[in-house]
Amino acid sequence: MRRGPRSLRGRDAPAPTPCVPAECFDLLVRHCVACGLLRTPRPKPAGASSPAPRTALQPQE
């Protein structure tokens, strides 16, 4: 099993590379990986005590 691409920049991650639509670039492992969709809910109505927390749509299993 080959090691990760560490020779050029050591443990620094390279700039993100284009990934297919269902994927995104993971700086930690330096590869395109499966990604879910990030979303920010609409703000609560005026007078609500705190802003809605940011959440995400789960990745397809």
């Epitope: 443990r11 930690l28 879910g36 990030l38 990745p59």
Partner: antibody
């Protein structure tokens, strides 16, 4: 249901070997990275190794480099941690975990969302 | 390697209190920080990822903020089930590193 189940822990003498398994269900380990994290008794969390099964890429903590090997069998949906030349300081509960990613401007925003129950490795004579 | 320094290492609080835990990275990690909760004998649970995003199913009393080197986990109103140890973790550069933990105890 997503689940990770570790096995293979136990008591081993210094210098000995163990192979831990992490059987995944409810998702494919090919889709992301799998990590091993350990916790010595009464101590904090220490990352040990990761693997991206699709690419075969791996990395290790300096404390285990050259002694531990992480691998994966995608047909069995299982990751492994082969531990050789074990030392007393390797005594810990070993967890495997899945890293989840969400797309934030093309880059992963994520964390370790599913963890196994842990398996205890005791290195003692 | 990037060091993650949490403070305080422990704190005592009462139900209903607002609790803040901080984490400082030894170098810029952008927003690549996650927060976990761990109870004795159990595996950690993901609370917050990417510094401020609440993981699915986590109560909204938990929130995270920060960018660069300074990060905060806040529990707006501490509940009995929140007494646990909390860890920050950076995932900007391998190796991913954890803070030493903050134990939240009952006052």
């Amino acid at each position: 249901e997503v689940q990770l189940v570790e096995s293979g822990g136990g008591l081993v003498q210094p210098g000995g070997s163990l192979r831990l398994s992490c059987a995944a269900s409810g998702f494919s380990i090919s889709s992301n990275s799998i990590h091993w994290v350990r916790q010595a008794p009464g101590k904090g969390l220490e990352w040990v190794a990761w693997i991206t099964p699709t690419h075969g890429s791996t990395d290790y903590a300096d404390s285990v480099k050259g002694r531990f090997t992480i691998s994966a069998d995608t047909s069995k949906n299982t990751a492994y941690l082969q531990m050789n030349s074990l030392r007393a300081e390797d005594t810990a509960v070993y967890y495997c975990a899945r890293r989840v990613c969400y797309n934030r401007l093309g880059v992963c925003a994520g964390g370790m969302d599913y963890w196994g129950q842990g398996t205890l490795v005791t290195v003692s004579s | 390697d990037i060091q993650m320094t949490q403070s305080p290492s422990s704190l005592s609080a009462s139900v209903g209190d607002r609790v803040t835990i901080t984490c400082r990275a030894s170098q810029d990690v952008s927003t690549a920080v996650a927060w976990y909760q761990q109870k004795p004998g159990k595996a950690p649970k993901l609370l917050i990822y990417s510094a401020s995003f609440l993981y699915s199913g986590v109560p909204s009393r938990f929130s995270g903020s920060g960018s660069g080197t300074d990060f905060t986990l806040t529990i707006s109103s501490l509940q009995p089930e929140d007494f646990a140890t909390y860890y920050c973790q950076q995932s900007r550069i391998t190796p991913p590193t954890f803070g030493q933990g903050t134990k939240v105890e009952i006052k």
